[in-house]
């Protein structure tokens, strides 16, 4: 079995990726410039730290979280980095074109890099459902389509519903999940006989996936608070996210043990359930008025996550062809919906408390936003799935799914893995 790329992909990928990179460089040259008004260098460093947290989450957290496959760990980490690097560049340009361009050049600030990193994170969440079944050329397409779809969704929501940066970015959980699931649904599903072992997890990669989960766990408060307007809101977001993820860890480990007949703890459950609280509080993290509410939400999210991890993979594997260990997609779809519902409940409480009689209208707006996010995610996901099925991308043969050796040079291995 040759470990080389098929000849056509060897021609296609570098040409496609480098042409795209050259185009991006030209766009940056003609249409962007840096914010020249930075007065306070100390403040600049503090502001950069948030962006740094987001980059760590994306590159290390999500990179390693998806690396638990026995024979696909290298590709998971490196492809994630590739997608992040490409996604951030395109997201900065797209956000600039959509929000600033009429006034002239796109001004690049630390905030725009923050936004772009979060947009690229969406792709890294979605791709969990398809990693191992696609090559880098296909992933480039997925990055471009998803970042474009999310950017446009955010602009539409911002313009129609007048939502702030935090709110329209927090649809990322639901959007990324449904996008990834709809792409997966379009890809060839059955694994041929004899390759089932490749989508199993192994101890060393599972440990690195746990490392990814730990990085995400540590930095999730930064993610949920990154786009908030005032320090008091950011403080609330950090605290509430921290309480929620703390409780979801306890729930994940104990719930996993409870779900197993012999009381054993499943690595796969824990990888994803430790993050459950962070996803569930995302939308309303700055609004939750007291810690116990965030903790209850973390508990519920942890239970949903463990329950989902136990009962949904069978269905997802049959219908969508998603391997048992790639549970981020349906996990985030459930928890994202939970988060949106919590936000709507809090809005109702706010409206009732203020006695302003606008409950129906507020709920309608929120449901409209959520529905729009899901519809655009599904439509753009299906479009991406159809694009990825085109022959020009030379997708890996189904017998080579979840195989690092298709993509990587291993000098110490002549054949096999």
């Amino acid at each position: 079995m040759s470990s080389k790329y098929p000849r056509s992909v060897r021609r296609c990928l570098p040409l496609w990726a480098l042409t795209l990179e050259a185009a991006l460089i030209l766009l940056f040259y003609f249409f962007t410039h840096y914010d020249a008004s930075l007065e306070d260098q100390k403040g600049l460093v503090a502001s950069y730290q948030v962006g740094q947290d987001l980059t760590v989450m994306a590159a290390i957290g999500l990179g390693f979280l998806t690396s638990s496959f026995r024979r696909h760990s290298w590709s998971s980490v490196a492809f994630n980095l590739f997608m992040l690097a490409l996604g951030v560049q395109w997201a900065i340009l797209l956000d600039g074109f959509l929000s600033q361009f009429p006034s002239g050049k796109v001004v690049i600030t630390l905030f725009s890099i923050r936004l772009a990193t979060m947009s690229a994170l969406s792709v890294l969440i979605s791709v969990d459902a398809v990693l191992g079944k696609v090559n880098l050329a296909q992933l480039v397409v997925m990055v471009l389509v998803e970042v474009t779809a999310l950017g446009n969704l955010r602009m539409v929501i911002s313009n129609i519903f007048n939502t702030d940066y935090h709110m329209n970015m927090m649809h990322i959980y639901v959007f990324a999940a449904y996008f990834g699931l709809s792409v997966a649904w379009c890809l060839p599903k059955p694994l041929p006989e004899g390759t089932e072992d490749k989508d199993q997890t192994a101890t060393i990669p599972s440990l690195s996936a746990m490392l990814g989960a730990l990085f995400l766990w540590m930095f999730w408060p930064s993610f949920n608070s990154a786009l908030l307007r005032s320090p008091i809101e950011r403080k609330n977001a950090v605290f509430n996210t921290y309480y929620a993820v703390a409780v979801s860890v306890v729930t994940a480990i104990s719930g996993s043990s409870l779900a197993h007949p012999q009381g054993k703890i499943s690595k796969t459950y824990v990888h994803s359930a430790v993050l459950a609280g962070g996803v569930a509080v995302g939308t309303s993290c700055h609004l939750i008025p007291s810690p116990w509410l965030a903790m209850v939400l973390g508990l519920v999210a942890g239970l949903i996550s463990v329950g989902g991890a136990k009962y949904l993979p069978g269905c997802c594997n049959r219908v969508l062809g998603i391997p048992h260990s790639s549970i981020m997609g349906y996990n985030f779809s459930l928890l994202g919906l939970l988060g949106e519902i919590i936000y709507i409940v809090l809005l109702v409480l706010d409206t009732v408390g203020a006695g302003n009689g606008m409950i129906g209208f507020q709920v309608l707006l929120s449901i409209g936003e959520l529905s729009l996010a899901i519809v655009i995610a599904l439509m753009s996901g299906l479009l991406t799935g159809l694009l990825l099925n085109l022959k020009i991308w030379k997708a890996p043969h189904e017998a080579k799914y979840f195989d690092d050796q298709v993509f990587w040079k291993f000098p110490h291995l002549a054949v096999g893995f």
Partner: antibody
Framework: EVQLVESGGGVVQPGRSLRLSCAAS????????MHWVRQAPGKGLEWVAV????????YYADSVKGRFTISRDNSKNTLYLQMNSLRAEDTAVYYC??????????????????WGQGTTVTVSS | DIQMTQSPSSLSASVGDRVTITCRAS??????LNWYQQKPGKAPKLLIY???SLQSGVPSRFSGSGSGIDFTLTISSLQPEDFATYYC?????????FGQGTKVEIK
């Protein structure tokens, strides 16, 4: 005492530039968003620009976008407004104001609770 | 941008009168509405935030109501120091906007 003091106003020719400053005292400057608001002679208030507490985000009214730049130096407790390509219609009293976030029942609401005394900018040939 | 329209643009009233000023938004702004008072040659002063919450230090004769599109500022019993111009302002969107102002004069 919480105080905002604007400076830098004056008479300037159309097309020229001017930089306004707003010195803050009596509160923790780096935890508040800051705004510039102007008032043309005999006219109402017009919101001009805002900068977030950490300087990470800025917004401008359409009438000044691309010409005015808001910035802040948290180490000096100072807010700035760099005004380029000035026009006659930019003649006004310019106020800086502090943004406060106040919790409602659940949500946060924003208002400008502290204002400076204003500095006059006259654009005339 | 959201347009804010105040009415009336000016009114004459006597000390002790009940005065009502209305503000209408071009689209729903929930309760993201503030009221300011400005006296000639002075900086504006925050009276009401979040449509109906009284800013500390502001007399209780001032009150605000409304949500969505229509809002009202009421002065229950006009005092000599209340003769000024009043502005509504929305903070619902990132680009804030003021109403054109209502001048309250002595009859």
């Amino acid at each position: 005492e919480v105080q905002l003091v604007e400076s830098g106003g004056g008479v300037v020719q159309p097309g020229r530039s001017l930089r306004l400053s707003c010195a803050a005292s009596g509160f923790t400057f780096n935890t508040y968003g800051m705004h510039w608001v102007r008032q043309a002679p005999g006219k109402g208030l017009e919101w001009v620009a805002v900068i977030w507490y950490d300087g990470s985000n800025k917004y401008y009214a359409d009438s000044v976008k691309g010409r005015f730049t808001i910035s802040r130096d948290n180490s000096k407790n100072t807010l700035y407004l760099q005004m380029n390509s000035l026009r006659a219609e930019d003649t006004a009293v310019y106020y800086c104001a502090r943004e406060v976030a106040v919790r409602g029942v659940i949500r946060y609401y924003y208002a400008m609770d502290v204002w400076g005394q204003g500095t006059t900018v006259t654009v005339s040939s | 941008d959201i347009q804010m329209t105040q009415s009336p643009s000016s009114l004459s009233a006597s000390v002790g009168d009940r005065v009502t000023i209305t503000c209408r938004a071009s689209q729903s702004i929930s309760s993201y509405l503030n009221w300011y008072q400005q006296k000639p040659g002075k900086a504006p002063k925050l009276l009401i935030y979040a449509a109906s919450s009284l800013q500390s230090g502001v007399p209780s004769r001032f009150s605000g109501s409304g949500s969505g599109i229509d809002f009202t500022l009421t002065i229950s019993s006009l005092q000599p120091e209340d003769f000024a111009t009043y502005y509504c302002q929305q903070s619902y969107t990132t680009l804030w906007t003021f109403g054109q102002g209502t001048k309250v004069e002595i009859k």
